[in-house]
């Protein structure tokens, strides 16, 4: 008789990251019985919402359940039937939901009321929607990379099984970049985190880990722009905004009720001359970067140390891993690899933002025009914020990794979300029987 | 400003494969699915199939399915629709489209022309 | 497959007058608590133009005066008042489950 094989004890589970630019759906996937161990989970799928972030459907909040249905839908093909009421279902929306928040509590509510609504629909287990914090985004991305690199394993090996891992338990730091915020979290060597609202206390696997995380909201790539966008349209001499953090030749017209939209720009507000204004590219790297700068202020600091903006920042410490649009962006722009220097980085920035327009298009035919013309804004804007913002130097610059998935897993937030909301990180190392689900974080 | 340029019309032989495309410029593919349709000449619309192209996932009518293949190339941001195993009842305008929500919300539609494709022996 | 029946197969109507032209599916097309419905105008020797979405969302750029409702399996479309760039042929569309089918169209000529 043949041997049929039994079927697999697996468990699954779906987290969606509704973030300020766009959705995507992560299902995970473990085996039933290792729930306990340490870097047994992984994604099995992504599916990105086709569209805007769920922000966008303020004004028709009816159609956000035909918005989400392809990718419920995926998830539905991809776990098998057995397992869907068993199945949990999070999402966790991130800034562009903060800030629709600060403008109308009514209205944030309201969109979180039909999302939560629509995805009730579906045959999983829905466990809520809700806007989950910038601390908790800054130490869910820390969880997930140093869950996936195997930091929180008390096995030594001899091999290495994931890349970055240098074979010590010495956590990476998480370096995250969204549209509308921007985390930096990492365990400081030794130094007591001056600001409580920034220090993080977890027992995970039976070690103690003092983190200091940040989110700098309104510093994510977009909002980042449009405070740029507001800070230069006030000193122009009339409805032509020449910016240099855009290629030679391009041209684009900005309704000046779209630049103060946002709570971002509010600091910049003023009344203009005109209704529209057009932006001009000059694309310099130099001049790009001066004003960029002029979005951190690093004149005042109660602290020992600063970032910017008087928000207190331990001394760097480690390896980081840079992940989101760090990763999207310097992929893009081929600048990924860990030989690449950050002067060298600077170099390829500079030739980049020069190249006129008109051959960016042609040489990037499958690229949405609206992200194309970006990427020079938003490389120069990475370097000044890891370099001015963070106080990397061109020799701590080999430190930070740009990480898009590790071990087949996207880096990012919503695994350690996950992981978190399942129970699946023990604060005590678990014996070879796993422990009834005691403490955790 | 979003255009769908799809290839020229094609008479084929009974049997042959064809293969057409529609050059999508002023929208980035990866940022929605694309529609094939066809209508046989005065009669109405066949929904063929579609393609998600940021990861290559096609679902078909059944009946196309194994004789019809939808690929697409976001590089040059085109898709493209392969017939094989013609037959005269294949005669039709095939149109590709997009259709989906964009940046701001707005639920868009946009077309190809139409690509006649003539089975004739 | 779901089945789509439209009726009637040609309207004959006067300009200003309100157009109906109703759908029916062969089953549901309901699915978490949306009608996958959608409704084309095609104009002769011119590609199909979505105009209502989910059964009732009106498309980008259409008219109010294009409007549509229902659930389940019957579905409608109105056009109140029509105006002469009206007049052409409107199919029904189910995209609940592939194969996603159109229904067999409808003529709206003028009276």
């Known amino acids: 008789t043949q041997n049929k094989a039994l079927p697999e004890n697996v468990k699954y589970g779906i987290v969606l990251d509704a973030g300020s630019s766009h959705t995507s759906l992560y299902i995970y996937k473990w085996p039933a019985e290792k729930e306990n161990d340490t870097g047994v989970v992984h994604q099995v799928e992504e599916c990105r919402v086709k569209g805007p972030g769920i922000s966008k459907f303020v004004q028709k909040v009816n159609e956000i359940g035909i918005y989400l249905t392809d990718c419920m839908e995926r998830a539905r093909e991809v776990i098998p039937r057995s397992q869907h009421q068993e199945t949990p279902v999070y999402l966790g929306a991130t800034a562009g939901m903060r800030l629709l928040r600060m403008e109308s509590e009514e209205l944030a509510d309201r969109v979180l009321d039909v999302v939560e609504r629509s995805l009730s629909n579906y045959p999983f287990d829905f466990q809520g929607a809700r806007i989950i914090t910038g601390q908790e985004e800054g130490a869910y991305g820390w969880i997930t990379i140093n869950y996936l690199l195997g930091k929180f394993s008390q096995k030594t090996r001899w091999f290495s099984i994931v890349p970055y891992e240098t074979n010590n338990q010495e956590t990476f730091g998480a370096l995250d970049l969204g549209g509308a915020s921007t985390q930096v979290t990492f365990v400081p060597q030794n130094q007591t985190i001056e600001s409580p609202d920034n220090a993080l206390q977890f027992r995970l696997y039976g070690k103690d880990y003092n983190v200091y995380t940040h989110s700098f909201l309104c510093y994510g790539k977009d909002q980042a722009l449009w405070q740029k966008l507001a800070k230069d349209i006030q000193v122009a001499s009339n409805e032509i905004l020449r910016d240099p953090c855009f290629h030679p030749g391009y041209k684009k017209v900005v309704n000046v009720s779209d630049l103060y939209k946002t709570p971002c720009t509010k600091r910049f507000e003023m009344t203009l001359p005109f209704q529209q204004f057009e932006i001009q590219g000059i694309g310099n790297y130099q001049q790009c970067h001066q004003s960029i700068l002029e979005l951190f202020n690093t004149s005042y600091c109660p602290y020992s140390q600063c970032a910017f903006n008087g928000i207190f920042l331990p001394p760097l410490q480690g390896d980081f891993g840079a992940f989101s649009a760090f990763y999207f962006v310097m992929k893009f722009l081929n600048l990924t690899s860990e030989k690449v220097s950050q002067e060298k980085v600077t170099e390829m920035m500079k030739k980049f933002c020069a190249q006129p327009w008109e051959e960016i298009k042609t040489s990037y035919a499958g690229v949405k025009e609206k992200y194309l013309s970006e990427y020079c804004f938003s490389g120069t804007y990475i370097l000044s914020l890891l370099l001015q913002g963070y106080h990397f130097t061109a020799d701590s610059w080999e430190h930070i990794h740009f990480i898009g998935k590790i071990q087949g897993s996207d880096a990012g937030w919503t695994l350690g979300y996950m992981l978190n909301l399942t129970n699946m990180i023990p604060a005590e190392q678990p014996l070879s029987t796993p422990l009834s689900h005691s403490t955790y974080v | 400003q979003v255009q769908l340029l799809q290839s020229g019309a094609e008479v084929v032989k009974p049997g042959a494969t064809v293969k057409i495309s529609c050059k999508v410029s002023?929208?980035?593919?990866?940022?929605?699915?694309v529609h094939w349709v066809r209508q046989p000449p005065g009669q109405g619309l066949e929904w063929i199939g579609k393609?998600?192209?940021?990861?290559?996932?096609?679902k078909f009518d059944p009946k196309f399915q194994g004789r019809f293949t939808i690929t697409a190339d976001t590089s040059i941001n085109t898709a493209y629709l392969e017939l094989s195993s013609l037959t005269s009842e294949d005669t039709a305008v095939y149109y590709c489209?997009?259709?989906?929500?964009?940046?701001?919300?707005?639920?868009?539609?946009?077309w190809g022309q139409g690509t006649l494709v003539t089975v004739s022996s | 497959n779901i089945v789509l029946t439209q009726s009637p197969a040609t309207l004959s109507l006067s300009l200003g007058q309100r157009a109906t032209i109703s759908c029916r599916a062969s089953?549901?097309?309901?699915?978490?608590?949306?009608?996958?419905m959608n409704w084309f105008q095609q104009k002769p020797g011119q590609p199909p133009q979505l105009l209502i979405y989910?059964?009732?969302n009106q498309g980008s750029g259409i008219p109010a005066r294009f409007s549509g409702s229902g659930s389940g399996t019957d579905f409608t479309l109105n056009i109140n008042p029509l105006e002469s760039e009206d007049f052409a042929v409107y199919y029904c569309?189910?995209?609940?489950?592939?194969?996603?089918?159109f229904g067999p169209g409808t003529k709206l000529e003028i009276k």
């Open positions: 489209a997009l259709y989906g929500y964009d940046d701001d919300a707005y639920y868009f539609d946009y």
């Open positions: 989910a059964a009732s």
């Open positions: 393609i998600d192209p940021a990861n290559v996932n096609t």
């Open positions: 569309q189910q995209s609940k489950e592939v194969p996603y089918t």
């Open positions: 002023g929208f980035s593919i990866k940022d929605t699915y």
């Open positions: 089953e549901s097309v309901d699915n978490y608590g949306i009608s996958f």
